[in-house]
Interface confidence: medium
């Protein structure tokens, strides 16, 4: 949404000089029962790839109907295809479920591109490769959609894992994760490890490939290296966070940090790209172009419209810069940074015409609804959505794609002053358009 009035932006709020570090309070968070350790049954329970989303197998109804469900931290409805559609191999058949209850209420969800409508009901839901529980959850049975389901994506519904505030038709519709926590002993936390392929996958490879893990109720140490660093959830609607500084190859973009969060910054597994506000996008692209100037790329590449290809195995990763986002830390005046590689922000795609080549799309794009840390960011990290403590944790993913020279990183602490001023306060209007 374009706002007619923009609040005055403060300048000079960048991070302190690198190297000035604050001591961490503790190296690791204290152990909490049921929240850490090994979750073998949940590891590798996701499939898919960043371009079409990551999905988990779920069952709905009695007897159970198995469906693949997109894991989406950027929305809050559990919605499944409930009618034939050319892109669906299967769909939820309410009439076959003895436990389905109709709520006699419709729901409509428009996105920037695409939309769906359906009817609300409740049914019994479980996750075969998740906690051994069954919950009665709200389900939006999608009866009609446009540009929502993706041909060949292999998922038939969406699991919105964000908060009730952005649920449709309103915040009275309890999201799935809230129902899960209320009805079971599952701790109020989940974590995601999305594993980008690093190379294009054809249909048969996607169906056979492992896409990552959604650990429900805990943290699995085997999925990350190094330490987990936490940033506060600013407000419980989307998973909103605050970015306090942005660097391209260590060079500060030197923008008023409010710009980075205009009008919000969210962590969204249902979005492919790293999406940046217009001004930030323009500055970032200018800086990335300058850093990679040894090769010239068409304008369409930077707009995400054109592919660039190199002979198989010769992609010049080294000419592309790393990108660091500094996030507000849990301690006053302390931040930490997450750093991604071109292996994350150049998305491999298959170019039928030149199948011998390695082709990529630039997976950073412009946004009019704030920063969206989509799959290209998340694929570098193990991300902990610690709802109980209102914070999001980042650690280097054990499955992220890198080369022998550089790796994704999560590092801190750094001194950053006046970080609260980096948050943008959205004027109190109806923010329920769910634009993604």
């Amino acid at each position: 949404t374009q706002h007619g009035i923009r609040l005055p932006l403060r300048s000079g709020l960048g991070g302190a000089p690198l190297g000035l570090r604050l001591p961490r309070e503790t190296d690791e968070e204290p152990e909490e029962p049921g929240r850490r350790g090994s979750f073998v049954e949940m590891v590798d329970n996701l499939r898919g790839k960043s371009g079409q989303g990551y999905y988990v197998e779920m069952t709905v109804g009695s007897p159970p109907q198995t469906l693949n469900i997109l894991v989406d931290t950027g929305s809050s409805n559990f919605a499944v295809g409930a009618a034939p559609h050319p892109f669906l191999h299967r769909y939820y058949q309410r009439q076959l479920s003895s436990t389905y209850r109709d709520l006699r209420k419709g729901v409509y969800v428009p996105y920037t591109q695409g939309k769906w409508e359906g009817e609300l009901g409740t049914d019994l839901v479980s996750i075969p490769h998740g906690p051994n529980v069954t919950v009665r959850a709200n389900i939006a049975a999608i009866t009609e959609s446009d540009k929502f389901f993706i041909n060949g994506s292999n998922w038939e519904g969406i699991l919105g894992l964000a908060y009730a505030e952005i649920a449709r038709p309103d915040d009275s519709l309890e999201p799935f994760f809230d129902s899960l926590v209320k009805q079971t002993h599952v701790p109020n936390l989940f974590s995601l490890q999305l594993c980008g392929a690093g190379f294009p996958l054809n249909q048969s490879e996607v169906l056979a490939s492992v896409g990552g893990s959604m650990i429900i109720g805990g943290i699995d140490h085997s999925l990350y290296t190094g330490s987990l660093w936490y940033t506060p959830i600013r407000r419980e609607w989307y998973y909103e966070v605050i970015i306090v500084r942005v660097e391209i190859n260590g060079q500060d973009l030197k923008m008023d940090c409010k710009e980075y969060n205009y009008d919000k910054s969210i962590v969204d597994s249902g979005t492919t790209n790293l999406r940046l506000p217009k001004k930030v996008f323009e500055a970032a692209v200018k800086s990335i172009k300058a850093a990679s100037s040894t090769e010239k790329f068409p304008d369409g590449f930077w707009l995400g419209e054109q592919l660039v290809c190199w002979q198989a195995g010769t992609t010049p990763w080294n000419i592309f810069p790393v990108i660091s986002l500094y996030l507000m830390g849990e301690v006053t005046n302390q931040s930490f940074r997450i750093t991604i590689l071109p292996q994350q922000y150049l998305r491999p795609v298959e170019d039928v015409a030149t199948s011998q080549d390695d082709c990529y799309k630039f997976a950073i794009s412009q946004s009019s609804t704030g920063t969206v840390m989509g799959a290209v960011i998340m694929e570098g990290f193990y991300v902990v959505f610690d709802r109980a403590r209102k914070r999001i944790g980042f650690a280097v993913s054990a499955c992220h794609v890198h080369d022998e020279f550089r790796t994704a990183a999560v590092e801190g602490p750094f001194v950053t002053l006046d970080m609260e001023d980096c948050g943008y306060n959205i004027p109190q209007t109806d923010e329920s358009t769910l634009m993604t």
Epitope: G81, A82, A83, P84, H85, P86, L88, Y91, G106, V107, Y108, P110, K115, E117, G118, E119, T143, E144, S145, D146, F149
Partner: antibody
Framework: EVELMESGGGLVKPGGSLKLSCAAS????????MHWVRQAPEKGLEWVAY????????YYTDTVRGRFTISRDNAKNTLFLQMTSLRSEDTAMYYC???????????????WGTGTSVTVSS | DIVMTQSQKFMSTSVGDRVSVTCKAS??????VAWYQQKPGQSPKALIY???YRYSGVPDRFTGSGSGTDFTLTISNVQSEDLADYFC?????????FGAGTKLEIK
């Protein structure tokens, strides 16, 4: 039994208006997208307009866009077609028809009403 | 718009015969084609959807075939009650379009 019954047709002068209704029974009306299809005398079938179950998806054929408005009242199980700026070429039998399955795959018409006749003539 | 062409306006057949009604799309529509029967003074009824799937309650003497641009409705063992107009329809893209119809006459 699944039934659709149109009403509201009649004789109207060019430039005039008419509102057609279609009463549905025997199925959960809000689950289904609904169409209007017309058939000029001794002619073939022509699709006119479509409205989805929740009224969020609405489509028209080019010749009626801007003149006709499709709507529905799910509480009353009724479909409407408001026709304005009528022309002689709008003369036809107007059928309401149910969209099969209410899913995005099958855009054929599985149940048809008996039709209501509209004549536009001076 | 996709044009659906039914080249035969009329077809004459006898009870017990087999008859094929054809329909050609102006561009590829996959299998997104339906066939309807309209008896004199009545509204149309669905016979076939997705080019070859028989609608529930339709006698198995009606079969549909084809994909892409060429489609056929075949009526084997024609009965007197099959006297009707037959229309094809594409639902591959908007606007939804019909063929002009083929009138089946029984000798």
């Amino acid at each position: 039994e699944v039934e659709l019954m149109e009403s509201g047709g009649g004789l109207v002068k060019p430039g005039g208006s008419l509102k057609l209704s279609c009463a549905a029974s025997g199925f959960t009306f809000s689950d289904y997208g609904m169409h209007w299809v017309r058939q000029a005398p001794e002619k073939g079938l022509e699709w006119v307009a479509y409205i989805s179950g929740g009224s969020n998806f609405i489509y028209y054929t080019d010749t009626v866009r801007g003149r006709f408005t499709i709507s529905r009242d799910n509480a009353k199980n009724t479909l409407f077609l408001q026709m304005t700026s009528l022309r002689s070429e709008d003369t036809a039998m107007y059928y309401c028809a149910r969209r099969a399955y209410y899913g995005s795959s099958y855009w054929y018409f599985d149940v048809w009403g008996t039709g209501t006749s509209v004549t536009v003539s001076s | 718009d996709i044009v659906m062409t039914q080249s035969q306006k009329f077809m004459s057949t006898s009870v017990g015969d087999r008859v094929s009604v054809t329909c050609k799309a102006s561009q590829n529509v996959g299998t997104n084609v339906a066939w309807y029967q309209q008896k004199p003074g009545q509204s149309p009824k669905a016979l076939i959807y997705s080019a070859s799937y028989r609608y529930s309650g339709v006698p198995d003497r009606f079969t549909g075939s084809g994909s892409g641009t060429d489609f056929t409705l075949t009526i084997s063992n024609v009965q007197s009650e099959d006297l009707a107009d037959y229309f094809c329809q594409q639902y591959s893209s908007y606007p939804l379009t019909f063929g002009a119809g083929t009138k089946l006459e029984i000798k």
